[in-house]
């Protein structure tokens, strides 16, 4: 669809005569008839296949024709067509004399014709005017012409219909050749596909408008590249949705069981060394001068009985001092000036000479120690109590006071977490090193089988298009993780471009 436009510029008829040579009375009141038709090697009379148009009286004898396109559209003359422009044409322009006001062909005498020109040739669609001048014996006509496409028609022959739009059917403007030019933020053959936020994950994100990044189930973050861990996951991460991979030092289904009490709570005081010994269980190894489960108690330096051979200990600001009994000397009264002759062994200990009598050694009876058998044996010095148990001397024996969760002579046994039947609704209890685990019967979930649930929401295979189904244990619903190319709560919608429009 397009328009052949003819712009009449000047007509010269100096003598004011008709084609027959007869003069017009009083002058030639001139109007034009235009016939546009298909290409003919020799332009002949016949139907004006591309259209006709007539003008009103434009002037008398010789005159210039005003450009009247702004005020009524009479010049240039418009010859619209509703077909593909063939690129060739024939044009007949007749100048007629109008004796009266009736310009209809049947109202005019046949000899009212002033002049007739006929041209034919090639004409491409375009904005540029072609200027032409046709001269006969008595007249001259100067004019220009062109072919342009109608609104919304494009291409070399005005055959491509294109209407700019910005709605659900497309977001584009039309190029001169009729091809689409997508508006910013849109892509695809018909500019229906939004360009998502730069960096938005191809599989895990999508968008319904430009510069957006909406996450598919199981993903989060500005670019939908962070998986969502299992609901309730405390100290864990994920690499795929709904996982709960525990951080170092944490265990359990929700990574909420503390396996590294030492690091997370630093219970040992005064520079003691902490050792994990189970879930929420630890042992502190105290530095010299400290005691207590958490090495929180400061010992007097004399408490370790550093003075040997019956020497008495005196606390001092910078340490301690041993007052040695007669016959002994040294920092800890460890050197003897005595021999067996001096009966140095107490509590029934037997004396043995050494170094040809220059020294001696005492062999102590049970429950006594020291170089002179002067000390009762402290059965707690070897830290026999495990799992942070506290050692207590009880006369000739010792006992361990255990921390909660442990039992046995040396606190070496875990109290069975399952002994109190913690699993509800018939769940089976399993003792673990770091606590217990309940295996729940169908229809129940939770750490202690306390939550009544429906049967596995994924059992009915609700996800389409080979999507992965995850059961959300906290809500007993399913979540579908869609493969690339599908969206929807069940991955039921394909994402790809729609098939082609027909235009």
């Amino acid at each position: 669809s397009g328009v052949f436009q003819l712009q009449l510029q000047e007509f010269i008829n100096e003598r004011g005569v008709l084609a027959s040579g007869r003069p017009c009375e009083p002058g030639c009141r001139t109007f034009f008839r235009v016939c546009l038709k298909h290409f003919q090697a020799v332009v002949s009379p016949g139907p004006c296949t591309f259209g006709t148009v007539s003008t009103p009286v434009l002037g008398t004898n010789s005159f210039a024709v005003r450009d009247d396109s702004s005020g009524g559209g009479r010049n240039p003359l418009q010859l619209p067509f509703n077909f593909t422009w063939p690129g060739t044409f024939s044009l007949i322009i007749e100048a007629w004399h109008a004796p009266g006001d009736d310009l209809r062909p049947e109202a005019l005498p046949p000899d009212a014709l002033i002049s007739k020109i006929a041209i034919q040739g090639s004409l491409a669609v375009g904005q540029n005017w072609l200027l032409d001048e046709q001269t006969s014996t008595l007249t001259r006509l100067r004019y220009s012409y062109r072919v342009i496409c109608s609104d919304n028609y494009y291409g070399d022959n005005c055959s491509r219909l294109c209407k700019k739009r910005n709605d659900h059917f497309g977001h584009y403007v039309c190029q001169p050749d009729g091809n689409l030019s997508c508006l910013p933020g849109w892509t695809g053959e018909y500019c229906q596909q939004p360009i998502c936020l730069s960096g938005c994950h191809e599989q895990n994100g999508y968008c319904s408008k430009p510069a957006e990044c909406l996450c598919r189930p199981g993903w989060q973050g500005r670019l939908c590249n962070e998986c969502i861990p299992h609901n309730g996951c405390r100290h864990g991460t994920c690499s795929t949705p709904w996982q709960c991979t525990c951080d170092e030092g944490w265990g359990g289904l929700f990574c909420d069981q503390d396996l590294n009490y030492c690091t997370h709570h630093s219970p040992c005081k005064n520079g003691a060394t902490c050792s994990n010994s189970g879930q929420r269980s630890y042992t502190c190894t105290c530095r010299p001068g400290y005691t207590g489960v958490d090495c929180e108690l400061e010992l007097s330096e004399c408490d370790s009985n550093p003075c040997r051979n019956g020497g008495s200990c005196k606390d001092q600001e910078d340490g301690y001092h041993c007052l040695c009994p007669p016959g002994y000397y040294g920092l800890h009264c460890e050197h003897s000036t005595l021999s067996c002759a001096d009966s140095p062994c107490f509590n029934g200990g037997s004396c043995r000479e050494r170094n040809q009598g220059a020294n001696y050694a005492c062999e102590c009876p049970p429950n006594f120690t020291g170089s002179n058998c002067e000390k009762k044996v402290d059965r707690c010095t070897s830290n026999p109590c495990a799992n942070g148990g506290q050692c207590l001397n009880r006369g000739p024996s010792r006992m361990c006071r255990c921390r909660p969760g442990f039992t046995g002579t040396y606190c070496e046994l875990h109290v069975s977490d399952c002994a109190r039947n913690p699993c509800a609704h018939g769940g089976t209890c399993h003792d673990l090193e770091n606590g217990l685990m309940c295996t729940c019967p169908a229809g129940f979930s939770g750490r202690r089988c306390e939550v009544r649930t429906s049967i596995d929401a994924c059992a009915s295979s609700p996800c389409f298009n080979r999507a992965t189904c995850y059961t959300d244990l906290s809500t007993d619903t399913f979540v579908c993780n869609c493969p690339y190319g599908f969206v929807g709560s069940r991955c039921e919608f394909p994402v790809g471009l729609p098939p082609s429009f027909p235009w």
Epitope: K163, H168, F169, P498, S500
Partner: antibody
Framework: QLQLQESGPGLVKPSETLSLTCTVS??????????WGWIRQPPGKGLEWIGS???????YYNPSLKSRVTISVDTSKNQFSLKLSSVTAADTAVHYC?????????????WGQGTMVTVSS | SYELTQPPSVSVSPGQTASITCSGD??????ACWYQQKPGHSPVLVVY???KRPSGIPERFSGSNSGNSATLTISGTQAMDEADYYC?????????FGGGTKLTVL
């Protein structure tokens, strides 16, 4: 051959919610080649578009009805539904569901046979 | 809101050409389509995208659209063409229907 069939109550009381379902047979409602819509026609009057939804799950409504209308889809049943709340006698009409095709853009090329809904107490 | 205006009625003699107009602001910049509706029946699409015919629609139905007006032309009108005709276009994701024209074949 794709066919559309509307169903729902023929009588609704004023202030209640009108609910209709369109069942699609002979084609998939989740195909990216189609869009779907509801159109109504009061007795003796012209056609009025209610709303449409698309394969990308975008939904558009007639601005004059937007506050009262909801269109939803159930792909498992190959159905889409219309809910119009707070109805009055002015909502009495034949309600049509229709399909638009990407191959026939900007038009509804297949229509259901329509179902008459009367709003009256 | 966008409006499309149609004449309420048009009459034509059998065999003659019937023209039904639909006017709207810059309608030529949108794609227009036309539906035929006979009493008691659902609408049937007869012209889409200004001037295209769906399969099964007779060649006597044609359309044009430019400026502020779209036209449905039925050449060689037959008695069976007597019906209501509706134009429709989209404006910003909203479908708009004309008020309808009753075509009477005399």
């Amino acid at each position: 051959q794709l066919q559309l069939q509307e169903s729902g109550p023929g009588l609704v009381k004023p202030s209640e919610t009108l609910s209709l379902t369109c069942t699609v047979s002979g084609g998939s409602i989740s195909s990216s080649s189609y869009y779907w819509g509801w159109i109504r026609q009061p007795p003796g009057k012209g056609l009025e578009w209610i709303g449409s939804f698309y394969y990308s799950r975008s939904t558009y409504y007639n601005p004059s009805l937007k506050s009262r209308v909801t269109i939803s889809v159930d792909t498992s049943k190959n159905q889409f539904s219309l809910k119009l709340s707070s109805v009055t006698a002015a909502d009495t009409a034949v309600h049509y569901c229709a399909r638009g095709s990407i191959a026939v853009p900007d038009a509804f090329d297949i229509w259901g046979q329509g179902t008459m809904v009367t709003v009256s107490s | 809101s966008y409006e499309l205006t149609q004449p309420p009625s048009v009459s034509v003699s059998p065999g003659q050409t019937a023209s039904i107009t639909c006017s709207g602001d810059k309608l030529g910049d949108k794609f227009a389509c036309w539906y035929q509706q006979k009493p008691g029946h659902s609408p049937v699409l007869v012209v889409y995208q200004d001037n295209k015919r769906p399969s099964g629609i007779p060649e006597r139905f044609s359309g044009s659209n430019s400026g502020n007006s779209a036209t449905l032309t039925i050449s060689g009108t037959q008695a069976m063409d007597e019906a209501d005709y509706y134009c429709q276009a989209w404006d910003s994701n909203t479908a708009v229907f004309g008020g309808g024209t009753k075509l009477t074949v005399l």
